[in-house]
């Protein structure tokens, strides 16, 4: 077996127990079979190798671990627990590894874990205690600062009989363990709504990505507590209008940049306040690109170019005159 490379380039390890000539356990800092390791970069890459389990003999020096493009299916409790622990592991990327089940305590015993990417896994079963590690009402704080959960929605036929949004939010809020989270990415998850309590309990957020979902309204969502929020991505949703309460909250955030492109804005009388706000605010990035989708007569009109005379509502007919 070849020892781990100490150069900054990656060294592919030979399968270190393949020959069985030596029946000794592998050295603690040896590179696992099917992985590439750089001790200088403190990085291990086990990428696109169809692994069905997390390698057991990860080198203790690992700071950045890439396990992308595998077939892990399930992360059990203590999936990364080792003796001695992986005390340096700070960034863990598990994207695209066919995970559909992440159990309670899957990331326990990783005291330095700051970045976790579970994107592009069909997470039909994400335990409420996946990130908190215990079912206590208040857990030990997680060290996580960045949590990337883009495109984790399973196919329709694999979803359980429960709200996918609710399952994800339960994992985010359990035990208040993620109070230190600064970046949360939830893009491309078919979210229809954002549970109202989720943002209030993540007070440290700087970056929130909810792009490419199916959010229709933000009426019940409060951004008031997110005083550190710097970017809010709401592109490619199903937003029709932002109401006064939301506009005021966004305007009150001192560092915020909001991204609203590619939403089907309804340019009727309910849009007047938002148009007025858009003309005055500096928080919306690319606001000159926002266009109406409805009604038909307003399609492709630029929101910033509208005036109050353009924004009318059809009179509501009495029930006796409405057609079915």
């Amino acid at each position: 077996s070849s020892p781990t490379s100490s150069a900054s380039s990656f060294s592919s390890s030979a399968p270190f127990l393949a020959s069985a000539v030596s029946a000794q356990p592998p050295l603690p800092d040896q590179c696992p079979a099917l992985c590439e390791c750089s001790e200088a970069a403190r990085t291990v890459k086990c990428v696109n190798r169809n692994l069905t389990e997390v390698p057991t003999d990860l080198p203790a020096y690992v700071r950045n671990l890439f396990l992308t493009g595998n077939q892990l299916a399930v992360l059990p409790a203590g999936a990364f627990a080792r003796r001695p622990p992986l005390a340096e592991l700070a960034a863990l990327n598990l994207s695209g590894s066919r995970l559909d089940e992440v159990r309670a305590g899957a990331f326990e015993h990783l005291p330095s874990l700051r970045q976790l990417d579970l994107s592009h896994n069909p997470l039909a079963d994400l335990s409420p205690f996946a990130f908190s590690g215990s079912n206590a009402s208040v857990s030990a704080p997680s060290p996580l600062v960045e949590l990337i959960l883009n495109h984790i929605v399973p196919p329709e036929d694999e979803r359980q009989n429960r709200s996918f949004e609710g399952m994800v939010v339960a994992a985010l809020l359990a035990g208040r363990a993620l109070q230190g989270l600064r970046r949360l990415e939830l893009a491309s998850n078919h979210f229809l709504y954002l549970p109202r309590d989720v943002l209030a309990q993540l007070p440290s957020l700087r970056h929130l990505d909810l792009s490419n979902n199916s959010l229709v309204s933000l009426t019940y969502v409060s951004f008031r507590n997110l005083t550190h929020l710097e970017s809010l991505h709401l592109e490619d949703n199903a937003l029709k209008v932002l109401h006064n309460g939301t506009l005021a909250e966004l305007q009150g955030l001192p560092h915020i940049r909001v991204f609203l492109d590619n939403n089907p804005w309804v340019c009727d009388c309910h849009m007047a306040d938002m148009v007025t706000w858009l003309k005055e605010t500096e928080v919306v990035q690319g606001k000159d690109r926002l266009t109406c989708a409805y009604p038909e007569k307003m399609r492709n009109r630029v929101l910033l170019e509208l005036n109050s005379a353009d924004l009318d509502c059809d009179p509501i007919l009495p029930p006796s005159l409405q057609t079915s």
């Epitope: 127990l17 099917l34 692994l51 069905t52 389990e53 997390v54 003999d57 077939q71 059990p76």
Partner: antibody, heavy 120, light 111 residues
Framework: EVQLVESGGGLVQPGGSLRLSCAAS????????MHWVRQAPGKGLEWVSY????????YYADTVKGRFTISRDNAKNSLYLQMNSLRDEDTAVYYC?????????????WGQGTTVTVSS | DIVLTQSPDSLAVSLGERATINCRAS??????????LHWYQQKPGQPPKLLIK???NLESGVPDRFSGSGSGTDFTLTISSLQAEDVAVYYC?????????FGQGTKLEIK
């Protein structure tokens, strides 16, 4: 046809060593995780050890941890179990078995077994 | 460790009659994605043979008189119409976590 053939069993004194082998044929060996399972005379089945398809993961029962080492050679379609510091209670028929993964898998093919007897 | 307890320890059933074997786990071995419980048959002098995977999925080539059911902690193996060749010891096994464990076995005989 999937075939697993164990060898290397025999009589050994307590404290001694043995190396079991399992020769695989009839399937793509390098695509499958492999287990050792044992059965003491007149007793039930006991899982011993697992190795993943590419030798990245190794697991052992507490009863053998530190004494047994599992390994494989995909080029030779072979699985091994190095058994050191053998005890009377290691006496059993040892089976090798195939699986598609550790937790989401099951023992879907078995060898006929090789008998290990530890006795003074 | 998860303990699997089979009942009964032994069972005598007439040919053509139904045989039922139970397996109880000391904790749940099911998630909403998968059930980590499997059944095996071992005839005298032979290695075990997989019958049922993930609680209820019949292994290819196994006669359809065998069926499995259950989730969580309680599971059942049923032979709808006992045949002479079904005399064997039957084991349940979980793959929820390490260590993998088996039930103690149920010996099935002809009455």
């Amino acid at each position: 046809e999937v075939q697993l053939v164990e060898s290397g069993g025999g009589l050994v004194q307590p404290g001694g060593s043995l190396r079991l082998s399992c020769a695989a044929s009839g399937f793509t060996f390098s695509n499958f995780g492999m287990h050792w399972v044992r059965q003491a005379p007149g007793k039930g089945l006991e899982w011993v050890s697992y190795i993943s398809s590419g030798s990245t993961s190794f697991y052992y029962a507490d009863t053998v941890k530190g004494r047994f080492t599992i390994s494989r050679d995909n080029a030779k379609n072979s699985l091994y179990l190095q058994m050191n510091s053998l005890r009377d209670e290691d006496t059993a028929v040892y089976y090798c078995s195939r699986t598609n993964s550790l937790l989401r898998g099951f023992f879907d093919a078995w060898g006929q077994g090789t008998t290990v007897t530890v006795s003074s | 460790d998860i303990v699997l307890t089979q009942s009964p320890d032994s069972l005598a059933v007439s040919l053509g009659e139904r045989a039922t074997i139970n397996c109880r786990a000391s904790q749940s071995v099911s998630s909403s994605s998968y059930t980590y419980l499997h059944w095996y048959q071992q005839k005298p002098g032979q290695p075990p043979k997989l019958l049922i995977k993930s609680a209820s999925n019949l292994e290819s080539g196994v006669p359809d008189r065998f069926s499995g059911s259950g989730s969580g902690t309680d599971f059942t193996l049923t032979i709808s119409s006992l045949q002479a060749e079904d005399v064997a010891v039957y084991y349940c096994q979980h793959s929820w976590e390490i260590p993998l464990t088996f039930g103690q076995g149920t010996k099935l005989e002809i009455k």
